[in-house]
C-alpha cells in the first residue's frame, strides 16, 4: 500500500481467483483514543471500533472511503483504491491500446517544433467516474522540470456501437534548449482512476522523435505563360522553430488526379517552390518533415489546380 | 578552423546532410524493435553530445563558432572510431556495400574539413570493452546509429545555418 495523495491510498493486489489479498491497517487521524467507530462509504454499518482498523483487501467491495467517527462526527477519511496485477502485469483496463507505432501504446505524444512544448493524448470508452493526473520530467534519476496543464476531453467519436473519448494534455519543458542534442528522454506519467480502480501509464521519448510539423501554409499556384506548367509555392508553418536557416524543413509534393487510383508522382525538395504540371480537376499537395531527422511528416496541405 | 579561421561552410553543409541520409539508411525508423533497443538512460551517456553550453545554437554560432565546431569535430572523430571498431567489424559482418562503410568515410571526411592536417584537438577516449555476443553487438550498433542520427542532425543544422549566414 502507498499514498497517492493526502488520505488516498493505493493497494496493490495480485489478481487471481482466491488470491489472499493484502492486509491493511487504517489509523484514525485524531488524538482521541476511545469511542471511535469505522464505516465504509455511505453504508452506516459499523465495521469495527478503536483507533485502528485492520482489513483484508481482496476485491473492489473492500475498497472505497473508510471513515472513522466519534459521537456521530467524522474524524478522518481514507480512500482505498485498487491497482490490479494479473500474471505479473499491471492492468490496463481504462485506456485503449492505440497500437501505433507499436502494440501497448496507450499514450501518444507529438510536438510541433523544438521549443520543448508537446501534447499527449489517450483514448478510453469510459464516460463517467474517471479522473486523470499527469506528471512529466526530463530523465528519471535526476529529473529536470516539465510543467503540464490540465487534462481536457479533446474529442468524442462514435466507433460502431461504442463511444470513444480522447483526452489530452499540453506540457512544456521548463528549461528547453531547442538547438541541443537531447541526452535524456522526456518521461510522461499518467494516473487514471475509474471508480475505485487505479492504473498508471507511462511514455518515454525524445522531443526529436515526436516532432510532427504543422502543414505548410499559404500554398499558391501561378500559371506559367504558354505552358501547361504552374509555379507552386508555399511557406513554413508559423508554429515551426526559427530561424529556418537553422531549423530547416524538407518537403514532399504531389499532384493528385481526380481518381484516387491515378498514379501520383512524389517529388522531394528543400525549396519552398516548384514547377509542376497541374491538370484541371487535379489538386496539388505538399507536406513537411524535419530536413535532418526523420521524424513524422506533417499532414498534407492541398489546393485545387483549377 | 583551429585558431579561428572559418570552415568551408557550404562543403560542410553538403557533407553533413549526406551524413544524415546515410545514418537513416543504415538504421531506418521502424514501428517496433525486434531486439529491445531501449535501455536505461545511462546507456548512451558515454557518447559525446552537443549540449546547451556548446555554442551550437544560432546566437552561439554568431558570437564564436569555434566552440561548437570543436565539439562537432570531437563527436565526428568519436563516432568514426566507433564505426571502425570491432562493434561493427565483428559478426554479423557488414557486406561490401554497407551504408556503415560510407558513413565511416563521410565522418572522416567531415572531420578533416574541420581540421586540416597538422592541427590536433584532443578527442574523447573511445570506450574499450566490446561485446562478445552477436546480439549484444547488434544492440550496441543500433544504439550507436540512433545517437549518431541525433548528433549529425544538430551538426547539419549548424552547417546549414553557417552556410546561410556566416559564409564570407
Amino acid at each position: 500500500i502507498w499514498e497517492l495523495k493526502k488520505d488516498v491510498y493505493v493497494v496493490e493486489l495480485d489478481w487471481y481467483p482466491d488470491a489472499p489479498g493484502e492486509m491493511v491497517v487504517l489509523t484514525c487521524d485524531t488524538p482521541e483514543e476511545d469511542g471511535i467507530t469505522w464505516t465504509l462509504d455511505q453504508s452506516g454499518e459499523v465495521l469495527g471500533s478503536g483507533k485502528t482498523l485492520t482489513i483484508q483487501v481482496k476485491e473492489f467491495g473492500d475498497a472505497g472511503q473508510y471513515t472513522c467517527h466519534k459521537g456521530g462526527e467524522a474524524l478522518s477519511h481514507s480512500l482505498l483504491l485498487l491497482h490490479k496485477k494479473e500474471d505479473g502485469i499491471w492492468s490496463t483496463d481504462v485506456l485503449k491500446d492505440q497500437k501505433e507505432p507499436k502494440n501497448k501504446t496507450f499514450l501518444r505524444c507529438e510536438a510541433k517544433n523544438y521549443s520543448g512544448r508537446f501534447t499527449c493524448w489517450w483514448l478510453t470508452t469510459i464516460s463517467t467516474d474517471l479522473t486523470f493526473s499527469v506528471k512529466s520530467s526530463r530523465g528519471s534519476s535526476n529529473p529536470q522540470g516539465v510543467t503540464c496543464g490540465a487534462v481536457t476531453l479533446s474529442a468524442e467519436r462514435v466507433r460502431g456501437d461504442n463511444k470513444e473519448y480522447e483526452y489530452s494534455v499540453e506540457c512544456q519543458e521548463d528549461s528547453a534548449c531547442p538547438a541541443a542534442e537531447e541526452r535524456l528522454p522526456i518521461e510522461v506519467m499518467v494516473d487514471a482512476i475509474h471508480k475505485l480502480k487505479y492504473e498508471n501509464y507511462t511514455s518515454s521519448f525524445f522531443i526529436r522523435d515526436i516532432i510532427k510539423p504543422d502543414p505548410p501554409k499559404n500554398l499558391q499556384l501561378k500559371p506559367l505563360k504558354n505552358s501547361r506548367q504552374v509555379e507552386v509555392s508555399w511557406e513554413y508553418p508559423d508554429t515551426w522553430s526559427t530561424p529556418h536557416s537553422y531549423f530547416s524543413l524538407t518537403f514532399c509534393i504531389q499532384v493528385q488526379g481526380k481518381s484516387k487510383r491515378e498514379k501520383k508522382d512524389r517529388i522531394f525538395t528543400d525549396k519552398t517552390s516548384a514547377t509542376v504540371i497541374c491538370r484541371k480537376n487535379a489538386s496539388f499537395s505538399v507536406q513537411a518533415q524535419d530536413r535532418y531527422y526523420s521524424s513524422s511528416w506533417s499532414e498534407w496541405a492541398s489546393v485545387p489546380c483549377s | 578552423v583551429p585558431g579561428g579561421s572559418s570552415p568551408a561552410w557550404a562543403q560542410c553543409q553538403q557533407l553533413s546532410q549526406k551524413l544524415c541520409t546515410l545514418a537513416w539508411s543504415a538504421h531506418p525508423l521502424v514501428g517496433h524493435m525486434d531486439l529491445r533497443e531501449e535501455g536505461d538512460e545511462e546507456t548512451t551517456n558515454d557518447v559525446p553530445h552537443i549540449q546547451c553550453g556548446d555554442g551550437c545554437d544560432p546566437q552561439g554560432l554568431r558570437d564564436n563558432s569555434q566552440f561548437c565546431l570543436q565539439r562537432i569535430r570531437q563527436g565526428l572523430i568519436f563516432y568514426e572510431k566507433l564505426l571502425g571498431s570491432d562493434i561493427f567489424t565483428g559478426e554479423p559482418s557488414l557486406l561490401p556495400d554497407s551504408p556503415v562503410g560510407q558513413l565511416h568515410a563521410s565522418l572522416l571526411g567531415l572531420s578533416q574539413l574541420l581540421q586540416p592536417e597538422g592541427h590536433h584537438w584532443e578527442t574523447q577516449q573511445i570506450p574499450s570493452p566490446s561485446p562478445s555476443q552477436p546480439w549484444q553487438r547488434l544492440l550496441l550498433r543500433f544504439k550507436i546509429l540512433r545517437s549518431l542520427q541525433a548528433f549529425v542532425a544538430v551538426a547539419a543544422r549548424v552547417f546549414a545555418h553557417g552556410a546561410a549566414t556566416l559564409s564570407p
Epitope: - | 539508411s25 543504415a26 538504421h27 531506418p28 525486434d34 531486439l35 529491445r36 559478426e91 554479423p92 559482418s93 557488414l94 557486406l95 556495400d97 554497407s98 551504408p99 556503415v100 560510407q102 552477436p134 546480439w135 547488434l138 550498433r141 546509429l145
Partner: nanobody, 121 residues
Framework: EVQLVESGGGLVQPGGSLRLSCAAS????????MGWYRQVPGKQRELVAT???????DYADSVKGRFTMSRDYDKRTVFLEMDSVKPEDAAVYYC???????????????WGQGTQVTVSS
Amino acid sequence: EVQLVESGGGLVQPGGSLRLSCAASVSIWSFKVMGWYRQVPGKQRELVATITTGGSPDYADSVKGRFTMSRDYDKRTVFLEMDSVKPEDAAVYYCNGRLWAHLTSSGHDVWGQGTQVTVSS
C-alpha cells in the same frame, strides 16, 4: 552475395514428418527476420512461419501445432520441422531472410531457390 540454400524436401506420406533446412552464406544474426514460405503452382506465395532476431516463431494458422521453426546459429541454418503432414501442405517451400539495413545498401530481401515437398500415399 548473400545466399540461402534450402534442402530436405521430398516425398512424404500424409501424417508423416519431414525436416527442411535453410543454410545461409552469412551469420543468421545478419537477418532481422527469417521465414519459410510456400507456393503451389498458379497460387500466390504464402507465409508458413517467421522468426525475428531474438524472438520466438510465429506460424500461419494452417500449420500451428504441426510445424516447428528453429535455428542453429553455429551452423548458420534455420529449420522447418513438419509433422502430421497433410496433402494440402504439398508445395515448393522457400526460405527468406531480411537483412538488417546497416549491413547492406541493396537487396535487403534474400530468397532461396526452393525445395519441393510432395505429399502422397
